[in-house]
Interface confidence: medium
């Protein structure tokens, strides 16, 4: 027991937070500001990461932790771990080559961010348009059809889904 | 080059409506947003609100309730409606291009000096 | 709302000095604060964004610092150009704010 521990590295004795101090005879030293370590055992400190620009900080980095990005208001993240900042679009619409478009007919978009999507294909799973589709909305499937005859219980169809206002976050 | 040009009245009653038109040269509001601010000796610079280049618009929750912003893009043009004007708002009304590298104010049109009074 | 503090209104300065023009935020805002100056009769000018990144064509006498809630823009070398307003402003969270400003004067 005693050789197998002689023979383990002692930087493995360094946790999260510290890295392995080879200019000082292998102490675990703490990291230093604006850095981190993640696991235990490092040789080096990796430097947090800093939200500049149109990015703003979600969290601060820690010993043990790199800093989180998200972006300033009117901007969204892009990419994994908010690599990027887009513009928003306003609902309805997708942001193209060439700024935000309209969704085209069939399509929509709730959000801000992403892509228009096709509108759901009711008569795929047998049922019928209940609530017409916009830019802003998906349709709503209703019963099939046949489900409609006389004597069937009625469907009250939902409200119209207001558009939030953009007020302030 | 870059630049905002507001058109305002001027002269506005108490109560009444304050619309100023702000035209942009120099780059597409295709790409970018325009804010809105304001200045008067009392108060400072106030940031009332912003429409983005896909036409969504945030704003301030001190003037949400009378408040709103639009625009043309093929004529390049952003425009400003505020209603139910008091003396309070007197004040110089700027609007400021947005750039892409942050949500702030890179040029700023020369300002059109609105006077609230009867 | 998030308040920005310009404790100092005005500021006296000599041609070749250096002086250090100070905000505060009310709340950690990281590094998302810009800086203007302006003067008398013009529109507001962006000199910083990012607490530390000169805007394309400003000189480099200017520079920015700070994060969390200290910021300090500092004119090395003022020249009488220089001599105008300075604002601040931050944009983490709407809505975006300004402080009061500090007027740069001559001694």
């Known amino acids: 027991f005693e050789r197998t521990r002689s023979l383990q590295d002692p930087c493995s004795n360094c946790p999260a937070g510290t890295f392995c101090d080879n200019n000082r005879n292998q102490i675990c030293s703490p990291c230093p500001p604006n850095s981190f370590s993640s696991a235990g055992g490092q040789r080096t400190c990796d430097i947090c990461r800093q939200c500049k620009g149109v990015f703003r900080t979600r969290k601060e980095c820690s010993s043990t932790s790199n800093a989180e990005c998200d972006c300033t208001p009117g901007f969204h993240c892009l990419g994994a771990g908010c690599s990027m900042c887009e513009q928003d679009c306003k609902q309805g619409q997708e942001l193209t080559k060439k700024g935000c478009k309209d969704c085209c007919f069939g399509t929509f978009n709730d959000q801000k961010r992403g892509i228009c999507r096709p509108w759901t294909n009711c008569s795929l799973d047998g049922k019928s348009v209940l609530v017409n589709g916009t830019k802003e909305r998906d349709v709503v499937c209703g019963p099939s059809p046949a489900d409609l005859s006389p004597g069937a219980s009625s469907v009250t169809p939902p409200a119209p889904a207001r558009e939030p206002g953009h007020s302030p976050q | 080059q870059v630049q905002l040009q507001e058109s305002g009245p001027g002269l506005v009653q108490p109560t009444q409506s304050l619309s100023i038109t702000c035209t942009v040269s120099g780059f597409s509001l295709i790409s970018y947003g325009v804010h809105w601010v304001r200045q008067s000796p009392g108060k400072g610079l106030e940031w009332l609100g912003v429409i983005w280049s896909g036409g969504s618009t945030d704003y301030n929750a001190a003037f949400i309730s009378r408040l709103s912003i639009s625009k043309d893009n093929s004529k390049s043009q952003v425009f400003f409606k505020m209603n139910s004007l008091q003396a309070d708002d007197t004040a110089i009304y700027y609007c400021a291009r947005n750039p892409l590298t942050a949500t702030v104010m890179d040029y700023w049109g020369q300002g059109t000096s609105v006077t609230v009074s009867s | 709302d998030i308040v920005m503090t310009q404790s100092q209104k005005f500021m006296s300065t000599s041609v070749g000095d250096r002086v250090s023009v100070t905000c505060k935020a009310s709340?950690?805002?990281?590094?998302?604060v810009a800086w203007y100056q302006q003067k008398p009769g013009q529109s507001p000018k962006a000199l910083i964004y990012s607490a530390s990144y000169r805007d394309s064509g400003v000189p480099d006498r200017f520079t920015g610092s700070g994060s969390g809630t200290d910021f300090t823009l500092t004119i090395s070398n003022v020249q009488s150009e220089d001599l105008a307003e300075y604002l601040c402003q931050q944009y983490n969270s709407y809505p975006l704010t300004f402080g009061a400003g500090t007027k740069l004067e001559l001694k």
């Open positions: 709340q950690n805002v990281g590094t998302n």
